[in-house]
């Protein structure tokens, strides 16, 4: 068997809402993956499990099942959404994300994703980790690759 390549492309969009009373931030983060099947037979993308970390704390998890079948020598782009919650001991972030004097409220998140593929009863897992920045102050749509973590205004990690 040849390789199945998984490439994490980046954040596609981040939609934010707040619970004012609870000082809680809700971020729905949609990510994009490219999965390439280098084999001469079809493979099934059985599931994608993802989690998002902020400051070493897991703030969101998602799992997608029975996603798609990728034909021989084909590639598919898959979007998946992880709902995240920043609250409790991180409620200071509420003040950062709602501070009106800041233009772009970028926070650095670690995106972790594991793709499970199957072919002829054989299962294979491929994992990726990537730091991305996301604006927690407004709804944002990103050009693919635009959210790559470089050097952004952010609270202490």
């Amino acid at each position: 068997p040849r390789s199945i390549d998984v490439k994490y492309i980046g954040v596609k969009s981040a939609y934010v809402s707040y619970d004012v009373q609870k000082r809680t931030i809700y971020l729905n983060i949609t990510n994009t993956l490219n999965i390439t099947n280098n084999n001469y037979y079809s493979v099934e993308v059985e599931n994608i499990t993802a989690q998002v970390q902020f400051s070493k704390t897991v703030i969101g998890k998602a799992r997608l099942n029975n996603i798609t079948i990728i034909g021989p020598l084909d590639m598919k782009q898959i979007d998946y959404t992880v709902p995240t919650v920043i609250a409790e001991e991180m409620s200071y972030m509420y003040d950062f994300c709602t501070l009106i004097s800041i233009k772009v409220h970028n926070i650095v998140l670690m995106m972790q994703v594991t793709v499970t593929t199957t072919y002829f009863g054989h299962s294979e897992q491929i994992s990726q980790e990537r730091y991305q920045y996301v604006d927690c102050g407004r709804n944002t749509t990103y050009q693919l690759g635009q959210s790559e973590y470089l050097n952004v205004l952010q609270p202490q990690q």
Epitope: Y92, I102, K103, L153
Partner: antibody, heavy 120, light 112 residues
Amino acid sequence: EVQLQQSGAELVRPGASVRLSCIASGFNIKDYYMYWVKQRPEQGLEWIGRIDPEDGDTEYVPKFQGKATMTADTSSNTAYLQLSSLTSEDIGVYYCTTRTWDLYYAVDNWGQGTSVTVSS
Amino acid sequence: DVLMTQTPLSLPVSLGDQASISCRSSQNIVHSNGNTYLEWYLQKPGQSPKLLIDKVSNRFSGVPDRFSGSGSGTDFTLKISRVEAEDLGIYYCFQGSHVPFTFGSGTKLEIK
């Protein structure tokens, strides 16, 4: 330490213009909006407007449109307020202000104020 | 523009008393993100204003807990539970929800 250092007091002739400066230290002004506030003698605070120093985009209170011009120079980390066609109505103290973020909390920053006197 | 109306203009108090200042906005000042950017400042003579409360009731760092803010929509209140000498000065409410931002006219807290 985050600081806003404003230029010294100005005594100007009626009809003249003056440019006030506000030098920021401890943070990069291009990451924040900068605001200007006016206070006439023995009067309250009046919000003049705000500037996005990165692209120069400005918002003014209508009564200050044409009277005040906000600019910024990101290379020197300085915000400016120009006042034109000065009259006795423009006498007062002018403050620059912004709110920055420091690790886990916000910091409210005000300059010490620049006093403008208009007299012939 | 949003007009901020403060009452009273002057508030004579005895040290140790409770003081209450009211601020009313001419329109709802809930920001599009759901937050209400209603703030309270204290200005002492010859000094720059100092932020006490932001987002209606959030006491700013270093502000004593005798200061509290409340309200919603268009009606807001600042309470000082036990007035101390260092609390004397002029209090301003401020709205930062809708551009152009606006201050109230101020309330002078003074000794009776």
